[in-house]
Amino acid sequence: SQPQAVPPYASENQTCRDQEKEYYEPQHRICCSRCPPGTYVSAKCSRIRDTVCATCAENSYNEHWNYLTICQLCRPCDPVMGLEEIAPCTSKRKTQCRCQPGMFCAAWALECTHCELLSDCPPGTEAELKDEVGKGNNHCVPCKAGHFQNTSSPSARCQPHTRCENQGLVEAAPGTAQSDTTCKNPLEPLPPEMSGTMLM
């Protein structure tokens, strides 16, 4: 295998062999090293000397191989914008934020900048499950057969109808999408509206 070129090295076509870890410096027409994540350029390269890197100070970071002369300032997750922290800032990574429970990301610019309350799903529906929590507003879907949901809520799930026989009871009224099955003791009299009807 061919040995690696040692920066700085001349580049006539303005491209470098390792695009991730090197960059073209047009003033000197050379390829120089980028600084690794967690560092910044403390001295720019020349035809003689390669880039000199230094570690980012506390509360600052650079996430990628870079030729930045400063580190980015760590920013807290803004609770006013509905955000909460899931991982702290390090020299190599910015603070990781997500929407607070019951909220979704309403504004996205490379990352979430503003969260809003999830919409309620009306009785008889539930929020469709998403791959990533907080990614979008609720999309309400009807409860599937044999299930119900009886509140207006952003997070309530459809529950299976009660099976009266499992409790030694009998069905008094069938369940709907918005209500559970009504059960009664088998020895109880029929409801008033059913009195007078005798089954022989």
């Epitope: 040995p3 690696q4 070129a5 040692v6 920066p7 700085p8 020349s46 035809r47 003689i48 000397r49």
Partner: antibody, heavy 119, light 107 residues
Framework: QVQLQESGPGLVKPSETLSLTCTVS??????YYWSWIRLPPGKGLEWI?????????NYNPSLKSRVSMSVDTSKNQFSLKLSYVTAADTAVYYC?????????????WGQGTLVIVSS | DIQMTQSPSSLSASLGDRVTITCQAS??????LIWYQLKPGKAPKVLIY???NLETGVPSRFSGSGSGTDFTFTISSLQPEDIATYYC?????????FGQGTRLDIK
């Protein structure tokens, strides 16, 4: 620390070929440019040329017709041949290594070896 | 080829003196200039690169300045170990060329 050591005959007859070798220790010959520079008595430094570890060369136009350089990566050596020498080629000959994978400057030099051209 | 004119060719100075050497390029070489120190029987040493940057491990009494065609090398306070010959070298274009050298000795 990289060290360079020139070696070869200290006396060469006129019209013959001067042959010098530079042995590199404390580092690989790969990835760098390797130069020969000379200092004739009472004169200034003169760049003879360079060879890249891969074999590509560039010679001073004033000496180009008489100069040949080669590299042996397995031995960590590179060499200079200067043909049809005259008394004007009497000098201290230095070998040197570039800072990086570019020819721009010589960071490491040997101590030099004196070559006298005389019959 | 780029001609490098160095002056003076020799100079005598007393210990503690400020010593200045100049180097002039025949065309603009930006800041692509090195100053070397040569002592007999020793490996030449880089003192200044990029016209004004001090090489690692070189005492701070050595300095360089200039850009374009005119360059200056200074020893702020001459020490006994500074007795040597000094050369400028351009690395703007091939062929690499050197100044004629300045031989420095003690008065």
């Amino acid at each position: 620390q990289v060290q360079l050591q020139e070696s070869g005959p200290g006396l060469v007859k006129p019209s013959e070929t001067l042959s010098l070798t530079c042995t590199v220790s404390g580092g690989s010959i790969s990835s760098y440019y390797w130069s020969w520079i000379r200092l004739p008595p009472g004169k200034g430094l003169e760049w003879i040329g360079y060879i890249y570890y891969g074999g590509s060369t560039n010679y001073n136009p004033s000496l180009k017709s008489r100069v040949s350089m080669s590299v042996d990566t397995s031995k960590n050596q590179f060499s200079l041949k200067l043909s049809y020498v005259t008394a004007a080629d009497t000098a201290v000959y230095y070998c040197a290594r570039s800072y990086s994978s570019a020819w721009y400057g010589s960071a490491y030099w040997g101590q030099g070896t004196l070559v006298i051209v005389s019959s | 080829d780029i001609q490098m004119t160095q002056s003076p060719s020799s100079l005598s100075a007393s210990l503690g003196d400020r010593v200045t050497i100049t180097c002039q390029a025949s065309q603009d070489i930006s800041n692509y200039l090195i100053w070397y120190q040569l002592k007999p029987g020793k490996a030449p040493k880089v003192l200044i690169y990029d016209a004004s940057n001090l090489e690692t491990g070189v005492p701070s009494r050595f300095s360089g300045s200039g850009s374009g065609t005119d360059f200056t090398f200074t020893i702020s306070s001459l020490q006994p170990e500074d007795i040597a010959t000094y050369y400028c070298q351009q690395y703007d274009h091939l062929p690499i060329t050197f100044g004629q050298g300045t031989r420095l000795d003690i008065k």
